[in-house]
């Protein structure tokens, strides 16, 4: 039997069950190569709690049809009292990129999973000649995906001082040049991922090989090599190839462009500081709101969701959009077909189409950008499910009471894109929320004491209290978790104080709750640190003592106790100084 | 392909304000990022403003910055130039550009341009 997805078949693919800290590998097309599962396990269980493997779906007792793959097993299970066999159900959609299989949920019996990839279109529209898997799961089985920044078409540009070249690349996948009318671009060889021009002539530096790769829980790595023999001629013999390391920053920021570090002998070392290298829960929410510790923002959408039955209506020439997100209200021109984006047609109104589904949606704070997504709508010609993307805009002068309108710029391979400016889009990141204080009319802020990315580093607190051999070591931060580099490497990645010694790193405590005026000091609490037995958390005060012009001083250890539950800081800094008279 | 016809040069008294527009049609919008270029008698074709299809993101030539504004309509699929404090060493061919390249200001990674809108700035 043929395979039936055959661009999916050279990986071994990976999906997780978060709830039950499970991970599975799977391999669509022959076995995957994990000894406990078997020689013929297709899709092998590795539950983490118990440390166990479990075949749950076997290659050779594999059924397939265009939207459907079923693995099954020769193991009975128990299903409301009827004897069934283990098995693994994997349901294809249509999708833009090759995508990754996700966990649906699971059953005694059955482990069902959905995959929305190029490979289950009835087109080839979306295929490329090369791409690679793009998403990696970390040690605590959290998701970084690099999909969202494929490029359907066109390529990003390498920021590199070399007036005479550019470097072109995209994201686990070729260059596609087709929509270009003219631009250099438009010279590069098909398959390549990586793309050098120089003066008229274009060449291919790197195709996609293999997927993207974890190199550390922030850092992410794709290679690409050129598989033409035949060396290019100023290359000094060597076989050119491109790295591309994306890192995700240790706080919010825009995002930023690919960066050259390093160019030798036609090998090209690329970095791109970008969040959505970070961990998905970090960027996405299945809700209209991102906020609490997961998020470093403060974002809630809610009150644009209409209520009555009335949405906003977007005009897009042919077409109407009737739209109401962040709600369940059913709009009354879609025909219960539960759309958040319903598209109607002008000269037509009987023709109704579902451009995305309210149960289906993202909202996603990435690299600065705010977007709501809302797919899985009626299928177009391609088998692609319609979906909407909202680029929403703050404007805290936008009309209809700040709530402002969405407007519709286009469509794209069934994909409808609108952008909305709205006051509800002002981002508040936790720090802009949290790192001042006021005092009646007096104003702290702790800003200049924040200390945001490499190559800046923690404070480091003095502690005379103990011997060279003992030695405990503080790393701080203000208003943000430390900073993994150097001896804090280790620490726990959302700790805002961190002890490190030489049996490892504790978690001190972590900025939840706003500095305080407190007895002409200001008082920073940061609690929920490790456990530290009776069911208590670590805590830690820190008290911040007015210093004119001294924003140098480290903090100072002056106390710990409570069994090592409570510690206390103190630090005199300008930073605790009293800013100006607020107005008003 | 897209076609860019740009609109609203003309002679300005130094210190004054112009806005440029520019109507794009053809292939869809908002795949496109899109940038306004200058080129004054007898020199090349330079980088003015910038802004990405996907956000509003924008980024500005240094000799512009402060002065000039680019933005966006996508109801009108139309593009514009804020244009004040305009200075005698602003008279130049005001041009419009489309490209599928993300984080470029160079002319060589757009495929669609205008024809351009002279922009003259003298007492």
């Known amino acids: 039997q043929a395979a039936p997805f055959p661009e999916l078949c050279s990986y071994t693919w990976e999906a997780v069950d978060t709830k039950n800290n499970v991970l599975y590998k799977i391999n669509i097309c022959g076995s995957v190569d994990i000894v406990q599962c078997g020689p013929s396990s297709a899709v092998c269980m590795h539950d983490l709690k118990t440390r166990t493997y479990h075949s749950v779906g076997d290659s050779v007792l594999r059924s397939a049809t265009r939207s459907l793959l079923e693995f099954n097993t020769t193991v009975s299970c128990d299903q409301q009292g009827t004897n069934h066999r283990v098995q693994s159900s994997i349901a294809f959609l249509c999708g833009k990129t090759l995508g990754t299989p996700e966990f649906v949920t699971a059953t005694e019996c059955v482990h069902y999973f959905e995959w929305r990839t190029t490979a289950a279109c009835k087109k080839d529209i979306f295929k490329a000649n090369k791409e690679v898997p793009c998403y990696v799961f970390d040690e605590e089985l959290r998701k970084h995906d690099l999909n969202p920044l494929i490029k359907l078409s066109g390529a990003y540009l390498v920021d590199d001082s070399d007036p005479d070249t550019s470097l072109f690349i995209n994201v686990c996948r070729d260059i596609d040049t087709l929509r270009d009318p003219g631009s250099q671009l438009r010279a590069c060889p098909p398959g390549t991922a990586a793309c050098l021009v120089r003066g008229h002539q274009a060449f291919d530096v790197g195709q996609p090989r293999d997927g993207l790769k974890l190199v550390r829980k922030d850092r992410l790595v794709l290679s690409y090599v050129r598989e033409e023999a035949g060396k290019l001629d100023f290359c000094d013999g060597h076989s050119p190839a491109v790295t591309i390391t994306f890192v995700c920053p240790s706080e919010r920021r825009e995002g930023t462009i690919p960066k050259l570090t390093a160019k030798s002998n036609c090998r090209y070392e690329i970095e791109w500081i970008t969040e959505y290298a970070c961990h998905r829960d970090y960027l996405e929410s299945k809700t209209c709101s991102l906020s609490g510790e997961q998020q470093d923002v403060s974002i809630d959408l809610t009150p644009l969701a209409q209520s009555g039955g009335s949405s906003y209506i977007s005009d897009g020439k042919e077409y109407l959009f009737y739209l109401n997100v962040c709600g369940e209200t059913e709009i009354q021109f879609c025909n219960k077909k539960q759309a958040a984006v319903c598209q109607v047609k002008k000269s037509d109104t009987s023709q109704v189409k579902a451009a995305g589904r309210y149960h289906n949606q993202t909202l996603r704070y990435s690299d600065g950008d705010l977007t709501l997504i809302y797919f899985g709508g009626d299928e177009c010609s391609s088998g692609f499910q319609r979906m909407s993307v909202i680029n929403f805009e703050c404007n805290k002068t936008a009309g209809n009471d700040g709530k402002g309108t969405p407007v519709f710029t286009g469509e794209v391979d069934c994909t409808y894109f609108f952008t909305w400016d709205t006051e509800y889009a002002c981002v508040k990141e936790k720090e802009d929320l949290l790192c001042g204080a006021t005092d009646g009319k007096k104003r702290y802020d702790l800003s200049a004491l924040v200390r945001h990315a490499e190559p800046e580093q923690n404070w480091e607190a003095v502690d005379g209290s103990q011997t060279e051999t003992e030695k405990k070591h503080f790393f701080i931060n203000i208003c943000h978790r430390v900073l993994q580099e150097g001896k804090a490497r280790g620490c726990p990645e959302d700790a805002a104080v961190c002890a490190v010694d030489k049996n490892g790193s504790k978690n001190l405590g972590k900025f939840i709750s706003s500095p305080m005026k407190e007895k002409g000091n200001i008082q920073l609490s940061y609690s929920d640190g490790d456990d530290c037995g009776h069911g208590k958390k670590i805590k830690t005060n820190i008290t911040l003592v007015c210093k004119p012009g001294d924003l140098e001083s480290a903090p100072v250890l002056r106390t710990s106790g409570e069994g090592g539950c409570f510690y206390e800081f103190e630090w005199h800094t300008a930073a605790a100084c009293v800013l100006s008279k607020t107005e008003g | 392909d897209v076609q860019l016809v740009e609109s609203g040069g003309g002679l300005v008294q130094p210190g004054g304000s112009l806005r440029l527009s520019c109507a794009a049609s053809?292939?869809?919008?908002?795949?496109?990022?899109w940038g306004w270029f200058r080129q004054a008698p007898g020199k090349e074709r330079e980088f003015v403003a910038a802004i990405r299809w996907s956000s509003s993101k924008t980024s500005y030539a240094d000799s512009v910055k402060g002065r000039f504004t680019i933005s966006r309509d996508n109801a009108k699929n139309t593009i514009y130039l804020q244009m004040n404090s305009l200075r005698p060493e602003d008279t130049a061919v005001y041009y419009c550009?489309?490209?599928?390249?993300?984080?470029?200001?160079?002319?060589?990674?757009?495929?669609?341009w205008g024809q351009g809108t002279l922009v003259t700035v003298s007492s």
């Open positions: 550009a489309a490209s599928i390249v993300d984080f470029t200001t160079n002319p060589s990674h757009f495929g669609s």
């Open positions: 053809g292939r869809t919008f908002n795949t496109y990022n």
